[in-house]
Amino acid sequence: LPAQVAFTPYAPEPGSTCRLREYYDQTAQMCCSKCSPGQHAKVFCTKTSDTVCDSCEDSTYTQLWNWVPECLSCGSRCSSDQVETQACTREQNRICACEAGRYCALKTHSGSCRQCMRLSKCGPGFGVASSRAPNGNVLCKACAPGTFSDTTSSTDVCRPHRICSILAIPGNASTDAVCAPESPTLSAIPRTLYVSQPEPTRSQPLDQEPGPSQTPSILTSLGSTPIIEQSTKGG
């Protein structure tokens, strides 16, 4: 004989649990139906009557199968420095995200942003790191040898120094290298290629801790067929 299907409410077998989308009501001591997302329990079950569900009212929601007597209130409207990425519906809460140039300083448990803050700016000698701080703010990193940043920005990364046949002024962490104009009388002489390295710098990012000190400039003699090695070290 096929197993009988129990209709809610029903008393569970000793040691067994209620089925999916059911809950055990400790007062009725029965397995009863949960309400679907977008609804809430209007009337709890009894030993003989199942849960009665009702739709969530405007500006309230339930995201999961539930037996709550009241739907949850949607969060307040997004503030002027935020954008609404998910609207409040009967089945989901409103989600607010920070507009460009800001990060979320205080998140709600549902993932919406409660408070946005302006992104920190990295000062000359420091670029924006590829990873973010745990709170979503910009992380600044000192420009690695061979790279520089001459801006105060929340988006600019360290850029490679220009490569000169003849170097006029070496670059450092906060300035680019300056190349000398090529002299035609020197064209037959084996060239010394300059890979400009930053000089020690005391610059530090705005709103950030100071970075490590920089290595001094290095002059590399490469002969007439130079091979350029670019540093991949992090700063």
């Epitope: 007062t27 009337v43 709890f44 003989t48 009557s49």
Partner: antibody
Framework: QVTLKESGPTLVKPTQTLTLTCTFS??????????VGWIRQPPGKALEWLAH???????YYNPALKSRLTITKDTSKNQVVLTMTNMDPVDTATYYC???????????WGQGTTVTVSS | DIQMTQSPSSLSASVGDRVTITCKAS??????IAWYQQKPGKVPKLLIH???TLQPGVPSRFSGSGSGSDYTLTISSLQPEDVATYYC????????FGGGTKVEIK
């Protein structure tokens, strides 16, 4: 307007059975989610839940008093009756009936009736 | 059975004071708690249900909070008309009242 009113004897003797009636208006016990419960309060003491009956006749009793209590309803008369056997002087109290919502809390109470158990 | 331990059993505070009453359940009651106010010689009146939902007509100085087994009723600014005994009721598993808190004015 929802109202409830308790009625019954003000004095009962020890070992006797107490019968209390709750007559209500403004709602019906044939309406889904409606219920009526009984609560008592000895002089100067806390409230104590006794029993409850739902629109579908499902009944619940305080486990400590279950053997002595019976709750019934007469939907057509808008009445709920509580009987309590083997009364004792410690059962002297004000007895209240109250409406219960579908989500199980008491929202409207009767004025209460004082019952004294004494020989 | 669920026991409800209410504290303090009595308190005396000045008008305008913030008053806090707590109820601790012997197990998780999933926010199914209501608070009642009973003035001397009167019937209990529902103030709050489902932990924090204020009944219509109840002054906003009354608020409720809590989860799991610990719950609180707060009167943000005590008024002379708040002199009463306050009871919690758990309705997560059957029904149990707390022992009551008598609130007086200093």
């Amino acid at each position: 307007q929802v109202t409830l009113k308790e009625s019954g004897p003000t004095l009962v003797k020890p070992t006797q059975t107490l019968t209390l009636t709750c007559t209500f208006s403004g709602f019906s016990l044939s309406t889904l989610g409606m219920g009526v419960g009984w609560i008592r309060q000895p002089p100067g003491k806390a409230l104590e839940w006794l029993a409850h009956i739902w629109w579908d006749a499902d009944k619940y009793y305080n486990p400590a008093l279950k053997s002595r209590l019976t709750i019934t309803k007469d939907t057509s008369k808008n009445q709920v009756v509580l009987t309590m056997t083997n009364m004792d002087p410690v059962d002297t109290a004000t007895y209240y009936c109250a409406r219960m919502t579908g989500t199980r809390y008491f929202d409207v109470w009767g004025q209460g009736t004082t019952v004294t158990v004494s020989s | 059975d669920i026991q409800m331990t209410q504290s303090p059993s009595s308190l005396s505070a000045s008008v305008g004071d913030r008053v806090t009453i707590t109820c601790k359940a012997s197990q998780n009651i999933n926010k199914f708690i209501a608070w009642y106010q009973q003035k001397p010689g009167k019937v209990p009146k529902l103030l709050i249900h489902y932990t924090s939902t204020l009944q219509p007509g109840v002054p906003s100085r009354f608020s409720g909070s809590g989860s799991g087994s610990d719950y609180t009723l707060t009167i943000s600014s005590l008024q002379p008309e708040d002199v009463a005994t306050y009871y919690c009721l758990q309705y997560g598993v059957l029904w149990t009242f707390g022992g009551g808190t008598k609130v007086e004015i200093k």
